[in-house]
């Protein structure tokens, strides 16, 4: 059918604390060896882990771009928490960057929200309370297949 | 697809590895949340299924190709989803078999069973 790919991160430098896995799985705040022998413990405020796994290097520490504040620190076990500083906000579907939230609302619209890290000002307007975005709505794309007979691997 | 028939999936890693030693295959439909399918443990083969699945579905590897496998029989219209190659999966507890989730996702590929 699809062959799917999947790129990981680069493996982060051997690690020398080592313990062993339980039933083939590390605790948070670790990964496993190649062999699947040993658990190795991630490196503090540089990688960490969340869940049992068996993941082969634990994942990156996010850094906190200019224009957001570190809510907590990278541990072994929990991922940087990050947050648009004020007058700033993220939008789910648009994750990549805090915008500018909107000083005011557009004429004939009344403000009911206000600009929080995660949502700009929300406005409706004044006769029949319609929210207003100012976001044109995206349209969501599926790849699709319709297989006849059997696939066979994708090389 | 018709029901009935039978269907293989492939998933390969782009990199040198998958990042992890178990590799697994979840679905989703509409509204719903992902739900794991199968995995296999790519060092010794050892693998793991859905109940919903068991007997009809096998999941396979390839560490030559860095490639694994799933090879769908006996398919249901119930099985029609959305179906993720997943690697890096997650667990609550060392002891269970069915993952919370995963690090690394496949793009999905739809299977579509119609009676």
């Known amino acids: 059918i699809t062959q799917q790919d999947l790129a990981p991160q680069q493996r982060a430098a051997p690690q020398q604390k080592r313990s062993s896995p339980s039933e083939g799985l590390c605790p948070p705040g670790h990964h496993i060896s190649e062999d699947g022998r040993d658990c190795i413990s991630c490196k503090y405020g540089q990688d960490y882990s969340t869940h049992w796994n068996d993941l082969l290097f634990c994942l990156r520490c996010t850094r906190c771009d200019s224009g957001e504040v570190e809510l907590s620190p990278c541990t072994t076990t929990r991922n940087t928490v990050c947050q648009c500083e004020e007058g700033t906000f993220r939008e789910e579907d648009s994750p990549e960057m805090c915008r500018k939230c909107r000083t005011g609302c557009p004429r004939g619209m009344v403000k009911v929200g206000d600009c929080t890290p995660w949502s700009d000002i929300e406005c409706v307007h004044k006769e029949s309370g319609t929210k207003h975005s100012g976001e044109v709505p995206a349209v969501e794309e599926t790849v699709t297949s319709s297989p006849g007979t059997p696939a066979s691997p994708c090389s | 697809v018709q029901a009935g028939d039978s269907l293989r999936l492939s998933c390969a890693a782009s990199?040198?590895?998958?990042?992890?030693?178990?590799v697994g295959w979840f679905r989703q439909t509409p509204g719903k949340e992902r739900e794991f399918v199968a995995a296999i443990n790519r060092n010794d083969g050892t693998t793991y299924y859905a109940d919903s699945v068991k007997g009809r579905f096998t999941i396979s590897r390839d560490n030559a190709k860095n490639t694994v496998y799933m090879q769908m029989a006996s398919l249901k219209p119930e099985d029609t989803a959305v179906y993720y190659c997943?690697?890096?999966?997650?667990?609550?507890?060392?002891?269970?078999?069915?993952?919370?989730?995963?690090?690394?996702w496949g793009q999905g590929t739809q299977v579509t069973v119609s009676s």
């Open positions: 997943a690697a890096g999966l997650q667990y609550n507890r060392s002891a269970d078999r069915v993952p919370v989730g995963a690090v690394y």
């Open positions: 990199g040198r590895t998958f990042g992890s030693i178990r």
